[in-house]
């Protein structure tokens, strides 16, 4: 029950997160005009990843798309790429996680397969969230750098009567939406990974293949190769043998891929 709840909650949190990442990517307010020096401007500028806009006091808003690809800053291109990768991974993750939900039965899908899918979607959500957080952070860093550069320019060369005030930009709403959305997607992904552990059959429940010897039964357990840390006395890989009878059912069952994770 707890596993289902964790998986379901992870899915919902990731869904909200990915919706937020999509919203942030589409939003125009990634950077907004800094009004510190001019709080009563009749012209308000703001910019997104895809276009820049100007809202006038008259109520008229004019937006212009960035119709060039080569002329755009490399950082902006990188942010675009990160956000798109985040959305694509998130969307695939959502698709996979729908089929992985424990509450949804699709044919005779085993828990091991659902566990695999849950883990896959969880990893996708984590990467998606990290892409969004990275994208937003790169853009924020770009803004901070430009802000201080333009501030330095504002206070130089103003010896004359005429002032040319450079437009400075600060953090827009999309940045905060992106950070929160990326965080939610990341949390959702972690929850999916936790749920995956609960969905997977325990080590004690692992099915073993029986080999019937003439003298006594010897079962070879897959997963018998233990990865050594190199710190203990067990520095060599040891095959673990376990004698005893096995049922016919066990003879036919094979270890799943998940047993090797």
């Amino acid at each position: 029950m707890a596993v289902t709840a964790c998986q379901g909650l992870g899915f919902v949190v990731s869904l909200i997160g990915i919706a937020g990442i999509i919203a942030a990517t589409c939003m125009d307010q990634w950077s907004t005009q800094d009004l510190y020096n001019n709080p009563v401007t009749a012209v308000f500028n703001y910019q997104g990843l895809w276009r820049s806009c100007v809202r006038e006091s008259s109520g008229f808003t004019e937006c212009r798309g960035y119709f060039t690809l080569l002329g755009l800053p490399a950082m902006l291109q990188a942010v675009r790429a990160l956000m798109i990768v985040g959305i694509v991974l998130g969307a695939i993750g959502l698709l996979v996680s729908i089929f992985a939900l424990k509450c949804i039965r699709i044919g005779s899908m085993e828990d091991s397969a659902k566990a695999n899918m849950t883990l896959t979607s969880g990893i996708m959500f984590i990467v998606s969230g990290l892409c969004a957080i990275a994208g937003v952070s790169v853009f924020a860093n770009m803004l901070v750098t430009n802000f201080w550069m333009s501030t330095a320019n504002m206070y130089t060369g103003m010896g004359g009567m005429v002032q040319t005030v450079q437009t400075r930009y600060t953090f827009g709403a999309a940045l905060f939406v992106g950070w929160v959305a990326g965080g939610l997607t990341l949390i959702g992904g972690v929850m999916m990974c936790i749920a995956c552990r609960g969905l997977a059959p325990e080590e004690t429940n692992y099915k073993a293949v029986s080999y019937h010897a003439s003298g006594h039964s010897v079962a070879y357990k897959p997963g018998g190769f233990k990865a050594s840390t190199g710190f203990g006395s067990n520095t060599k890989n040891k095959k673990i043998y376990d004698g005893g009878a096995r049922t016919e059912d066990e003879v036919q069952s094979y270890p799943s891929k998940h047993d090797y994770v």
Partner: antibody, heavy 120, light 113 residues
């Protein structure tokens, strides 16, 4: 045809109050940002106040801030300017003007004006 | 506040001649966001309210004769009447539309020589 008709002007003593009205017609009033502009006896034009279409944002000339209040009733297609604590320097011809939607914040239509004389 | 300085205060030009009015702002009226200048020109005839002639520094308002031309960038702007007509006798004002307060120039009185 766009029409702006101001009313409410008159003679008032310093410290007195007055409320100007501007009846608008011929356009979708609620869509437009509206302003009050005054013309002094020396013929200088002075912007007084602006209110955006929805009424959410208002802007004032520093010398009238706290004394004048711009408001609008979109249901009645009317713009108002409540003037309190009037001073002699507020004597002017007050115009109601519409800010054009695509005119880069320029005032594309003006009323005929209403005269306010602040005198003791 | 942005100070708008108009020159000359008055101007006498012969009919059919070119009239040029200048306007200088204390701060740039250019907006980098849309590459536009936020300056307007108005014409006021005696006993009438001001009439919008030019907005965005160079765009003629509909119905305004093409003899009226606006130009300039940033802080320096010009209104040119290519061939003065008798009906052009008026006071001309420039206005900052970029920053509140939306300040006006003191006006230039145009007369016929």
């Amino acid at each position: 045809e766009v029409m702006l008709v101001e009313s409410g002007g008159g003679v008032v003593q310093p410290g007195g109050s007055l409320r100007l009205s501007c009846a608008a017609s011929g356009f979708t009033f609620s869509t437009y940002t509206m302003s009050w502009v005054r013309q002094t006896p020396e013929k200088r034009l002075e912007w007084v106040a602006t209110i955006v279409g929805g009424g959410g944002y208002t802007y004032y000339l520093d010398s009238v801030k706290g004394r004048f209040t711009i408001s609008r009733d979109n249901a009645k297609n009317t713009l108002y300017l409540q003037m309190n604590s009037l001073r002699t320097e507020d004597t002017a011809l007050y115009y109601c003007a519409r800010m054009g939607l695509t005119q880069r914040n320029a005032l594309d239509y003006w009323g005929q004006g209403t005269l306010i004389t602040v005198s003791s | 506040d942005i100070v708008m300085t108009q020159s000359p205060d008055s101007l006498a030009v012969s009919l059919g001649e070119r009239a040029t009015i200048n306007c200088k702002s204390s701060q740039s009226l250019f907006n980098s966001g849309n590459q536009k200048n936020y300056l307007a020109w108005y014409q006021q005839k005696p006993g009438q309210p001001p009439k919008l002639l030019i907005y965005g520094a160079s765009t003629r308002e509909s119905g305004v004769p093409d003899r009226f031309t606006g130009s300039g960038f940033g802080t320096d702007f010009t209104l040119t009447i290519s061939s003065l007509q008798a009906e052009d006798v008026a006071v001309y004002y420039c206005q900052n539309d970029h920053t509140y307060p939306l300040t006006f120039g003191a006006g230039t009185k145009l007369e016929i020589k």
